[in-house]
């Protein structure tokens, strides 16, 4: 018996087609992805093959103005239109709190939404009961397939799930659910979830009875043969893991942003054992036409977005200096504003020992593309912010050793004075440079804001300590020459859309007046 698994993950609000780098589509003839194009390909496969499942491994939420405006209603609407068979909850599904998941998505989805390792407690338990499930048994042709879901146990540090959801260890939580499926005579089981490729592989190895793992969170691109676009494969598709009980378990993921549709063909024997697996992600490029009815629906929903982008988010009573003459040479108040917003967006009261789990932000000055003039009645709109942050990136959470941070700050000024983009703006950091010294040895003071303290204060950077830092995904990926970050990061979790982070902060503060306050000094 043969099963075709079509899968997406980490779509992050890319409902419309995008450029090759998943930013806003500029030249339509070279654009990719989007739900209208995805629908065309899915329907084509459904017509051609008998046993097809369309699965999503989480993080549909967060990433473009679509999510900012529609807050998840767009996800439910278009996933329903594409007739997804199941979805696993990702960490970003909790970005607007549990209510922001329940109302727009859980109550509106016509497909099961899954996670076995999220347990509700207190008053939420009855409210959310039945709206998401640990597993679902789906009829596919003459057979049944069990889908069991999982979500990153780090979600409380990455999003806003509140205090009434407990995120258990994935493997510990999955095993009893898989065992339950076995007792129900379900012998073909897919683990669908959002914890990252390393955890996906562990699930394949450790959870007895899981036949296939369909994952997300780490934006992992797997491919067999010559890849069709710019993404470099992390391994073959599918990635085969030998389980502790000796089975060959295929593990797949389909990069991110709806650029690819994962396509995996599995052959099972009559006892539900995987005999063979093969496939590849399908690049959703312009050779695949956008479905006209879905496209028309997208255009209808788009109207509200255009209106939103000119509405006032808040006011500034000071000039927001985002000029390259400032932000690439010295501390600039636009950099301070953005970093403050980045930290504010990551406030998660950890416990009595920590006022927050993260206190530091770094931001390449070259990523700040425009100032905002306060003389336009102080009005700040989404459109203004899109000029400041035009690249459609995310602000991510990483863990770095102090020694890596030191290298990053040396890199920040290694060729100072040439208006290059690597000059770092900061939050929760006080740095002093001495430009009379040789490159690589210009950082003379580097103090960082404590997290394990009731009254935050600045302490010298410790080289061997591990620090959490919020930074643009561009830097996490080694952009602007920050190769040391990419090479030495100990953990990387994708965050929220950059403009959304700043717009939310401005809306919350109502009136802003960021200053230049001595975060960056020269001796």
């Amino acid at each position: 018996w043969e099963l075709t698994i079509l899968h997406t993950n980490d779509v992050h609000s890319r409902l419309e087609q995008t450029s090759e780098d998943s930013s806003k589509c500029v030249n339509a003839s070279r654009c990719m992805g989007g739900v209208a194009r995805l629908f065309t390909k899915v329907q084509q496969i459904r017509r051609a093959e008998p046993n097809v499942l369309l699965l999503d491994a989480g993080d549909q939420y967060q990433g473009t103005i679509w999510f900012t405006v529609y807050k998840g209603a767009e996800v439910a609407h278009f996933m329903n239109a594409l007739r997804y068979d199941a979805m696993a909850l990702g960490n970003h599904e909790f970005d607007n709190g549990v209510e922001g998941l329940i109302e727009p998505l859980l109550k509106e989805a016509k497909f099961p939404i899954l996670s076995a390792n999220i347990k509700a407690k207190g008053p939420l338990a009855s409210q959310i009961s039945g709206l998401y499930l640990p597993y679902k048994v789906l009829p596919v042709g003459d057979e049944v397939v069990g889908i069991v879901g999982y979500t990153s146990k780090e979600t409380p540090f990455l999003s806003n799930p509140g205090t009434n959801l407990v995120f258990e260890d994935e493997i510990t939580a999955l095993q009893p659910e898989v065992d339950k499926l076995k007792t129900l005579n379900v012998n073909k089981i897919i683990a669908l979830g959002h914890s990252g490729f390393e955890t996906d592989k562990l699930i394949a190895q450790k959870v007895r009875g899981v036949d296939v793992v369909v994952g997300g969170h780490s934006n992992t691109f797997l491919y067999t043969g010559n890849p069709p676009s710019k993404e470099v494969p992390a391994g073959k598709y599918p990635f085969i893991v030998t389980s502790d009980d000796g089975r060959k378990v295929p593990v797949v993921q389909a990069y991110a942003f709806g650029k690819y549709l994962g396509y995996l063909k599995i052959e099972f024997d009559e006892r539900g054992n995987v005999i063979s697996s093969h496939g590849n992600p399908i690049l959703l490029n312009s050779s695949i036409p956008e479905d006209p009815s879905i496209k028309a629906d997208i255009n209808k929903w788009r109207i509200k977005l255009d209106n939103y982008s000119t509405q006032e988010l808040g006011k500034t009573i000071v000039y927001l200096d985002g000029s390259s003459q400032s932000c690439r040479f010295r501390e600039c108040n636009m950099g301070n504003l953005i970093c403050d917003a980045m930290i504010n967006n990551n406030l998660r009261h950890a416990d009595e020992m920590f006022w927050n789990h993260v206190s530091m932000c770094i931001l390449n000055g070259g990523g700040i593309r425009s100032p905002i003039d306060e003389r336009n009645n102080g009005t700040i709109t989404w459109e203004n912010l899109a000029a400041v942050l035009p690249f459609g990136g995310t602000f991510d959470l990483v863990q770095l050793k102090g020694s890596t941070l030191k290298k990053a700050f040396e890199h920040s000024v290694h060729r100072y004075g040439q208006s290059t983009g690597e000059f770092l703006q900061v939050g929760g950091i006080h740095v002093v440079y001495d430009l009379s010294r040789k490159p690589g040895d210009r950082v003379v003071k580097l103090d960082v804001l404590c997290t394990k303290c009731r009254v935050p204060s600045y302490d010298p950077l410790k080289m061997d300590e591990i620090y959490k830092v919020i930074l643009p995904n561009f830097l996490a990926n080694g952009g602007d020459g920050f190769q040391m970050i990419k090479d030495e990061l100990l953990r990387h979790d994708s965050g929220d859309q950059d403009i959304n982070v700043v717009s939310t902060y401005i809306s919350k503060m109502k009136v802003i007046y960021p200053a230049v306050e001595g975060r960056i000094k020269f001796s």
Partner: antibody, heavy 120, light 107 residues
Amino acid sequence: EVQLVESGGGLVQPGRSLRLSCVASGFTFDDYAMHWVRQAPGKGLEWVSGISWNSGSIGYADSVKGRFTISRDNAKNSLYLQMNSLRAEDTAFYYCAQGGYAILTALEYWGQGTLVTVSS
Amino acid sequence: DIQMTQSPSSLSASVGDRVTITCRASQGISNYLAWFQQKPGKAPKSLIYAASSLQSGVPSKFSGSGSGTDFTLTISSLQPEDFATYYCQQYNSYPLTFGGGTKVEIK
């Protein structure tokens, strides 16, 4: 576990030279600034010299400037102090100490010291 | 050069006493001050950095405070193993300089 082991001390006549070595283990040597600090018998501590991770920044106490040279070999996890034109007042225990990310950071770990005696 | 003046130069105290040592810099050094403990025949041991931050592994009976020019090291309840000489040191600017030391003896 961080370990710093000094060697090269001994009895030397005034005007002569001596080279002290310090071998480090238990940490990534080329991430850290390193220092020499000395202590004359029964006296207090005196900073002698410091060197940044890549030898880009070097500092000396006025009392040794022009006579002592600090250096490091990151490949060998070693710190050195070349002491020329030694004087009786250079007699002291010489300690190697680990700094932080730059020279102007706190000293954290210290070696057990090596005794230099300058006497005729 | 920045002069570091420690006081007292010596003190006698009993087990269980609260002991305070002060250190004054000849000019402002922000919080770039460290405290060390040294026992006879041993290398100095780092206790406090950045004026008030405890080095890992150092018991919480030791605390530091101050900023600018005036700093204190406090031992909340003196124990037999705390009888030693204590030094302050500034690392705000070259040359790094130490205080003259405070010898804590048994009364």
